[in-house]
Amino acid sequence: CDLPQTHSLGSRRTLMLLAQMRRISLFSCLKDRHDFGFPQEEFGNQFQKAETIPVLHEMIQQIFNLFSTKDSSAAWDETLLDKFYTELYQQLNDLEACVIQGVGVTETPLMKEDSILAVRKYFQRITLYLKEKKYSPCAWEVVRAEIMRSFSLSTNLQESLRSKE
């Protein structure tokens, strides 16, 4: 399954929107910084394309879920958030098309399930952090920056998979 070129452009637009969403400086939130334990090993180069697509899909689905809550809507600019949803939705569609084509369905299912679980736990930690910090502006900024970094890393993986073909 070949992800369309528009998928890469969409990823870049998503990162750009995340950057534009910034309301306060991360530098002002030093005391609120947290290591969420991004499961980088689940996005390692040892993965085959077939194994990464469901993990990437899970990552984007979780980002969508995180930013489509009531608390998120109150924290971010509505226009930017709507554009952000649209980009994520398009990427989910692209990845779902690959999953439907049966890519990797029979390959290392346990490995994939473990990876998807690791991504879910990562987002659970983020959600718990926001709750503990009472969804403060600094907590949301720390999370926005974290999602930018982790999404960027997963985007880099997509690019490296594309270049290996």
């Epitope: 002002s28 030093l30 970094r149 982790s150």
Partner: antibody, heavy 120, light 107 residues
Framework: EVQLLESGAEVKKPGGSLRLSCAAS????????MSWVRQAPGKGLEWVSA????????YYADSVKGRFTISRDNSKNTLYLQMNSLRAEDTAVYYC?????????????WGQGTLVTVSS | DIQMTQSPSSLSASVGDRVTITCRAS??????LNWYQQKPGKAPKLLIY???NLQSGVPSRFSGSGSGTDFTLTISSLQPEDFATYYC?????????FGPGTKVDIK
């Protein structure tokens, strides 16, 4: 084009004072945190201090706390480091650096450095 | 304070070699880790930010990986202009701290 230009080299006696300045151009100065980093001759890099874009938040290394003060004048696009009670161990090349905080915190642009020598 | 250690402290390599430098933090710092290159008499130059992001204009032979406490800078094929000293920097907490540096020289 982003440019950071530190003031000229200085020689001071122990116990003396000095103010370093760093003139910034090519970007919206007030939107960025700024930092000072130093390097003693033949040694590694040491972070000294940082200041938020508005100037409201400042941070210092323990080695300079209480002696050095970081400040900025956003109307003049200039960063400062006021150095008091200078010691021989403050002898170093001092760099000013811009802090990018869009997704992480990193010093993306640096000045050319200015040598401060503290000697009797 | 967060301590940063780097290994090796120096290495000799030839043009075309694959070079790996590691940096370890004394506590978890997420991906708040940056890599710099410095040549004698020059200001440091940002290579990698947020552990794995290549700074604009930096050749793709440089790459970074890691999160938490262990990080790696890799130069896939060493070029003549890459002989320099490399530093890691954590910006998770103040005081921000640099690693002691790794000097890469010609074998």
């Amino acid at each position: 084009e982003v440019q950071l230009l530190e003031s000229g080299a200085e020689v001071k006696k122990p116990g003396g004072s000095l103010r370093l300045s760093c003139a910034a151009s090519g970007f919206t100065f007030s939107s960025y945190a700024m930092s000072w980093v130093r390097q003693a001759p033949g040694k590694g890099l040491e972070w000294v201090s940082a200041i938020s874009g508005s100037g409201g938040s400042t941070y210092y290394a323990d080695s300079v706390k209480g002696r050095f003060t970081i400040s900025r004048d956003n109307s003049k696009n200039t960063l400062y480091l006021q150095m008091n009670s200078l010691r021989a161990e403050d002898t170093a090349v001092y760099y000013c650096a811009r802090v990018d905080s869009s997704s992480s915190l990193h010093f993306d642009y640096w000045g050319q450095g200015t040598l401060v020598t503290v000697s009797s | 304070d967060i301590q940063m250690t780097q290994s090796p402290s120096s290495l000799s390599a030839s043009v075309g070699d694959r070079v790996t430098i590691t940096c370890r933090a004394s506590q978890r710092i997420g991906t708040y880790l940056n890599w710099y290159q410095q040549k004698p008499g020059k200001a440091p130059k940002l290579l990698i930010y947020a552990a794995s992001n290549l700074q604009s204009g930096v050749p793709s032979r440089f790459s970074g990986s890691g999160s938490g406490t262990d990080f790696t800078l890799t130069i896939s094929s060493l070029q003549p202009e890459d002989f320099a000293t490399y530093y890691c920097l954590q910006t998770f907490n103040t005081p921000f701290t640099f690693g002691p540096g790794t000097k890469v020289d010609i074998k």
